[in-house]
């Protein structure tokens, strides 16, 4: 697995070099939690054929995936920081229970699957010091989150590829809007 | 597992205020939520609040703006800050942690008796 953002050798070798802003730490670390999904989005559409399925037929599902939409303020039209920086961390505390899900998924990519769990903590951390309302985020309920988990590991061999194939790709879409919304902020 | 321990309960009078404790023992106390729930006598046990990893807090409508939860975990504990107390606070308190995302609430306290007269 990567090294997590800050930890690399060249940061070490180069003691003159500014330290990071809020804003270039959050950019950063998006960044990093995207290279980890890349990986592990390569392993799955290695092993399975579900990446050459069609969104349309990959719509067909019944995952409450969390998505951006209008209302939420991070599109360019209507950008509103506050209610925006409430989305992110509200879907990133969301996608947690389907990384969760992830970690028993992957063979030859297993650290890499940790290390994007354990970076989402690290992105949310620094995300809460940058939110204004904390009280607007909802938590999700550990006990809905617990028969969410049990219903998606019990599902059969082609669903489970295909549940991960949906929470990689949505993962991925999520924080690439993230990304660009905050950079507006 | 984690053992949980309540203590701080008692009888108070209608509009006072009241700290309950919720003490970790076991493995390294850093659950995915901790919450406080309550069951008033002859019901069911019932959501009050809860605190994630991160330290945000959500409580239930009924207790909004008087209970605040909050955490230390250099104390292995959490507390429920229970302010303008109504009768209808009265119930047995209990606190559950759950250790991971997907474990639900899978550590629970024994409880401890909270009674306000008016």
């Known amino acids: 697995a990567p090294v997590p953002p800050g930890e690399d050798s060249k940061d070490v070798a180069a003691p003159h070099r500014q330290p990071l802003t809020s804003s270039e730490r959050i950019d950063k670390q998006i960044r990093y939690i995207l290279d980890g999904i890349s990986a592990l989005r390569k392993e799955t559409c290695n092993k399975s054929n579900m990446c050459e399925s069609s969104k349309e037929a990959l719509a067909e599902n019944n995952l409450n995936l969390p998505k951006m939409a209008e209302k939420d303020g991070c599109f360019q039209s209507g950008f509103n920081e506050e209610t925006c920086l409430v989305k992110i961390i509200t879907g990133l505390l969301e996608f947690e229970v389907y990384l969760e899900y992830l970690q028993n998924r992957f063979e030859s990519s297993e650290e890499q699957a940790r290390a994007v769990q354990m970076s989402t903590k690290v992105l949310i951390q620094f995300l809460q010091k940058k939110a204004k309302n904390l009280d607007a985020i909802t938590t999700p309920d550990p006990t809905t989150n617990a028969s969410l988990l049990t219903k998606l590991q019990a599902q059969n061999q082609w669903l489970q590829d295909m549940t991960t194939h949906l929470i990689l790709r949505s993962f991925k879409e999520f924080l690439q809007s993230s990304l660009r919304a905050l950079r507006q902020m | 597992a984690v053992q949980l321990v309540e203590s701080g309960g008692g009888l108070v009078q209608a509009g006072s205020s009241l700290r309950l404790s919720c003490a970790a023992s076991?493995?390294?106390?850093?659950?995915?939520?901790m919450g406080w729930f309550r069951q008033p006598p002859g019901k069911v046990r019932e959501f009050v609040g809860r605190i994630n990893w991160s330290g945000i807090t959500n409580y239930a409508d009924s207790v909004k703006g008087r209970f605040t939860i909050s955490r230390d975990n250099n104390k292995n504990t959490v507390y429920l800050q229970m302010n303008r107390l109504k009768p209808e606070d009265t119930a047995v308190y209990y606190c559950a942690a759950a250790s991971r995302s997907g474990s639900g609430y899978d550590s629970w306290g024994q409880g401890t008796q909270v009674t306000v007269s008016s």
């Open positions: 076991g493995r390294t106390f850093s659950p995915y939520t």
